[in-house]
Amino acid sequence: DWVVAPISVPENGKGPFPQRLNQLKSNKDRDTKIFYSITGPGADSPPEGVFAVEKETGWLLLNKPLDREEIAKYELFGHAVSENGASVEDPMNISIIVTDQNDHKPKFTQDTFRGSVLEGVLPGTSVMQVTATDEDDAIYTYNGVVAYSIHSQEPKDPHDLMFTIHRSTGTISVISSGLDREKVPEYTLTIQATDMDGDGSTTTAVAVVEILDANDNAPMFDPQKYEAHVPENAVGHEVQRLTVTDLDAPNSPAWRATYLIMGGDDGDHFTITTHPESNQGILTTRKGLDFEAKNQHTLYVEVTNEAPFVLKLPTSTATIVVHVEDVNEAPVFVPPSKVVEVQEGIPTGEPVCVYTAEDPDKENQKISYRILRDPAGWLAMDPDSGQVTAVGTLDREDEQFVRNNIYEVMVLAMDNGSPPTTGTGTLLLTLIDVNDHGPVPEPRQITICNQSPVRQVLNITDKDLSPHTSPFQAQLTDDSDIYWTAEVNEEGDTVVLSLKKFLKQDTYDVHLSLSDHGNKEQLTVIRATVCDCHGHVETCPGPWKGG
């Protein structure tokens, strides 16, 4: 039959070449002389000439060694023709399978593999995967089947078997307890890949395992005891820098310190922050300290990390003894603002009040007083006793110096310390009203027609306060009542002036006396311009003559 079974040829054959593989034979050769040929890749097309055929005998020849990793299978066609070139058989398929030899070593995909694992993890934790390839066949033979192993580990601490590798996947896992970044931050493993499923050729690579930091070390104060001196009253004053050491990775959350005042700061006088570079705890005053109240504070400060501890760790505590230094403090007026009621217009020399200051310092310092600001110059202050007396007339109605009945004075106290210090107080004099002002009409000039005159309504004002104001009473004096009438309205806060007899055009003085509810009387002269006109007028028509 014109058929041939698949031909298996080992790669890397040593010859001699050409090497006879198989014979092509057509049974038509009994009738006529047959000539054989082959076509296809490896014969007459690239790679040409690998195979040939003996034209007359039909022997299939291999001309050179094969490489399975280059071409694993050749598909050729065999041809049989008669002497005249006529085809005597259909083309026959010839399959040549190149069988594998273990002629390649495994190759790692990288010279150096890098992986990482957290310190202190459980055995079994996966770290990384390494990969090696082998060009040889791994399907029908073990030539390309790679088995992984760890050849060596550096350093060998805490012992030489910290990692294991999955024989077939190349996954490296932790196998032992004791990974400690602070002792060994990095392991270098020499890994092997061996073909023939572990019984063949070996190649090596390096796997570097970085041990990542876990917060398994507590920050520790060094030193644990501090003494500091702070002037009293200083706010935001740096008291002390506290230093800690932490074996975890610098500038990581496991290293960065967090400080907490655990005790001794009952008055919430202190605060502590972390310096971003040095990691020190900076203890400062949040409020001023008072030497006279407490001259020594003992603080207890605990330190932890930004990151939580991965295990139960004892926290470090520092003790800071803060000595408060005495400072000459300013006298303080008690109260800082003093409100005193005093009648306006009291006689000169009359006492107003006593306003004194206290010195926070324990020594019996002498305090002297003086007035710092007295806008109207109405007061004097005794330098020794703090007695305030009137030296001018206190006038409630003085709008330049008095606001809302209050006259504001600033006083000063000075101690005899070295250097001396001063404190100020504010004296708020509430001036009690006295009926010292009579009612006044507004306006004090009017224009009125002498025929059918319009009544003139004048507003009454009184600088005093109730009850020294309305209801007001009005009275015309000096014969003004011959021509004029004056009546106060029902509310008692306006006066109506009316012309009751004809007056020729001219300017006249109307003498109006107004008195308040306390019978304080005030005489006012109203200038009345009478015009020749009817009803309402604002200015006289035409020229007018005085008289």
Partner: antibody, heavy 117, light 111 residues
Framework: EVQLLESGGGLVQPGGSLRLSCAAS????????MSWVRQAPGKGLEWVSA????????YYADSVKGRFTISRDNSKNTLYLQMNSLRAEDTAVYYC??????????WGQGTMVTVSS | QSALTQPASVSGSPGQSITISCTGT?????????VSWYQQHPGKAPKLILS???KRPSGVSNRFSGSKSGNTASLSISGLQAEDEADYYC???????????FGGGTKLTVL
């Protein structure tokens, strides 16, 4: 002499809780991962839980996940197993053992936990 | 992941040798050289007798030996003695999430 001594076992009703302790001596306790392994009456060994030397890493078998909590106090050289929501199938002798990753050694003498109404 | 497979029981006469097999997969026994064996007498705690396939801890008799081929590990006991009668458990390191597997146990009877 390396020694592990369990305690805390006893009879408890279903849904109840128990806390087992394992006191270690004779070795650097904090350097080793520790495990709890249990053995139901007449049955084989079952790995229950493990904890790393620092205590920062833990493992639980699916059968106890969410109910049991392993912990350790290295300052007291003691391993703990807090067992909540106990079931009848948790009845077993509970052993603590140092776990090197590849093997368990040494083992404690075991403490019996019986879950029954 | 199921337990490693061990025969439920084996027996032998004093002085004889016996072998207990422990079959796993290419992810446990076949993948790592971390097979260990434990002996447990009735009412007692397990005791490590072999680690890393064939390493004996100090104090363990050299009558106990171990081997591994492919996915199967074996424990051999030569010169059987009455005190060898016990339950034997194999264990293997494995890929997560379990990390460790136990065999179902083999009861050794010394006839």
């Amino acid at each position: 002499e390396v020694q592990l001594l369990e305690s805390g076992g006893g009879l408890v009703q279903p849904g109840g809780s128990l806390r087992l302790s394992c006191a270690a001596s004779g070795f650097t306790f904090s350097s080793y991962a520790m495990s709890w392994v249990r053995q139901a009456p007449g049955k084989g060994l079952e790995w229950v839980s493990a904890i790393s030397g620092s205590g920062g890493s833990t493992y639980y078998a699916d059968s106890v996940k969410g109910r049991f909590t392993i912990s350790r106090d290295n300052s007291k050289n003691t391993l703990y197993l807090q067992m909540n929501s106990l079931r009848a199938e948790d009845t077993a002798v509970y052993y603590c053992a140092s776990w090197g990753g590849g093997w368990f050694d040494p083992w404690g003498q075991g403490t019996m936990v019986t879950v029954s109404s | 992941q199921s337990a490693l497979t061990q025969p439920a029981s084996v027996s032998g006469s004093p002085g004889q040798s016996i072998t207990i097999s422990c079959t796993g997969t290419s992810n446990d026994v076949g993948a790592y050289n971390y097979v260990s064996w434990y002996q447990q007498h009735p009412g007692k705690a397990p005791k490590l007798i072999l680690s890393e396939v064939n390493k004996r801890p100090s104090g363990v008799s050299n009558r106990f030996s171990g081997s591994k081929s492919g996915n199967t590990a074996s424990l051999s006991i030569s010169g059987l003695q009455a005190e060898d009668e016990a339950d034997y458990y194999c264990s293997s390191f494995t890929s997560g999430p379990v990390f460790n597997l136990f065999g179902g146990g083999t009861k050794l009877t010394v006839l």
